[in-house]
Interface confidence: low
């Protein structure tokens, strides 16, 4: 069964996929599609690459933000909605008959749980779950604890998701390591 990845409505979803170019720099075409990987190509293509760059995106919300030239073709879907839920196929189109690598991943989009804690609890909650702020779309994660919040949007899963993805990505980016999350 597919590995599940959870994202909240309005947040960015990250679906990992990677390969090792052999020899290094010898990139191969990749497609991402909505729906399980079919026999050939991708169904309902959302993004496609060639040997040089992304050459087909059905929406500006779909991005490859990884180290593309090292084979990190993980898909980022910006500002997800409930309609983005479902199985996605990452197909690495290695030349030759039936050589393709196929990876099915499942995206589960959930509504954010809005919690309005009692005032006495508020400070403890914001300290325990500081909001994750990022510089740019995928810049270094900074942790900030807001001072006084009359209404705390406590998105615990989002906090851990962003903490895991952004810090891991930034730590490994320049090392050239392949980023895999489960």
């Amino acid at each position: 069964s597919e590995v599940e990845y959870i994202a909240e409505v309005g947040q960015n979803a990250y679906l990992p996929c990677s390969y090792t170019p052999a020899p290094p720099g010898n990139l191969v075409p990749v497609c991402w599609g909505k729906g399980a990987c079919p026999v050939f190509d991708c169904s309902n293509v959302v993004l496609r690459t060639d040997n040089r760059d992304v050459n087909d995106r059905t929406s500006g919300r779909y991005w490859l933000k990884g180290d593309f030239h090292k084979g990190d073709v993980s898909l980022t879907i910006e500002n997800v909605t409930l309609a983005d839920s479902g199985v996605y196929c990452c197909r690495i189109q290695i030349p030759g008959i039936m050589n393709d690598e196929k990876h099915n991943v499942k995206l589960v989009v959930i509504k954010p749980a809005k919690v309005t804690p009692a005032p006495t609890l508020q400070r403890d909650l914001t300290s325990a779950f500081p909001r994750m702020l990022t510089t740019g779309e995928h810049g270094p994660a900074e942790t900030q604890t807001p001072g006084s919040l009359p209404d705390v949007n406590l998105t615990v899963s989002n906090f851990f998701c962003e903490l895991q993805i952004f810090t891991l990505t930034n730590e490994l980016r320049d090392s050239g390591a392949t980023i895999r999350t489960a």
Epitope: P24, L27, N51, R52, V54, W63, D67, F68
Partner: antibody, heavy 121, light 107 residues
Framework: EVQLVESGGGLVQPGGSLRLSCAAS????????IHWVRQAPGKGLEWVAD????????EYADSVKDRFTISADTSKNTAYLQMNSLRAEDTAVYYC??????????????WGQGTLVTVSS | DIQMTQSPSSLSASVGDRVTITCRAS??????VAWYQQKPGKAPKLLIY???FLYSGVPSRFSGSRSGTDFTLTISSLQPEDFATYYC?????????FGQGTKVEIK
């Protein structure tokens, strides 16, 4: 150590030709993009062309399209810029620089020392 | 083509000053912006890539940030070796384009 060394610059008459070379060492150009960037005297930086030797993709600025040709020889680890029909406005220091295959990461982390091209009669 | 409007074109500052240079893209470039430093007669050097990432070996007094299509290079405490010309560049679409440069001079 990563190094880029340009050569081939000089004085040429309008309408003439020059071939610039960019010899790379310390890395395999087939894994990267190689860019040519120029700088006219006292002016800013202008991108000219790029090539991804591993994939064979080439791109050009409109100002040089159909006049300049970028190429690479991976066996020599060298990129070239063939400049034809040169004009006075092509006078500049020409730098080669190393970039990356995917444009989202394609900043230029290593640059050559530059070679001066002067187009004048 | 995407225009990168850089400001100011020049500035005078003293050692220890905090210096801010801005670049505005004429359309969305995501985080595909780099900053370079160039000294007279020398090739440019990469300082910041992907809008906010400090390039290896660059002093931590340099930082970059993004707000929409506005990009900022900040030098927190100007040092004597920082007097140079600085360029922003977008590499989101072809052709890659540079800002016109900001010359940082000694006051």
């Amino acid at each position: 150590e990563v190094q880029l060394v340009e050569s081939g610059g000089g004085l040429v008459q309008p309408g003439g030709s020059l071939r610039l070379s960019c010899a790379a060492s310390g890395f395999n150009i087939g894994n990267y993009a190689i860019h040519w960037v120029r700088q006219a005297p006292g002016k800013g930086l202008e991108w000219v062309a790029d090539i991804t030797p591993g994939q064979g993709y080439t791109e050009y600025a409109d100002s040089v399209k159909d006049r300049f040709t970028i190429s690479a020889d991976t066996s020599k680890n060298t990129a070239y810029l063939q400049m034809n029909s040169l004009r006075a406005e092509d006078t500049a220091v020409y730098y080669c620089a190393r970039g990356y295959v995917y444009r989202m990461w394609d900043s230029y982390d290593y640059w050559g020392q530059g070679t001066l091209v002067t187009v004048s009669s | 083509d995407i225009q990168m409007t850089q400001s100011p074109s020049s500035l005078s500052a003293s050692v220890g000053d905090r210096v801010t240079i801005t670049c505005r893209a004429s359309q969305d470039v995501n985080t595909a912006v780099a900053w370079y430093q160039q000294k007279p007669g020398k090739a440019p050097k990469l300082l910041i890539y992907s809008a906010s990432f400090l390039y290896s070996g660059v002093p931590s007094r340099f930082s970059g940030s993004r707000s929409g299509t506005d990009f900022t290079l900040t030098i927190s405490s100007l040092q004597p070796e920082d007097f140079a010309t600085y360029y922003c560049q977008q590499h989101y679409t072809t052709p890659p384009t540079f800002g016109q440069g900001t010359k940082v001079e000694i006051k």
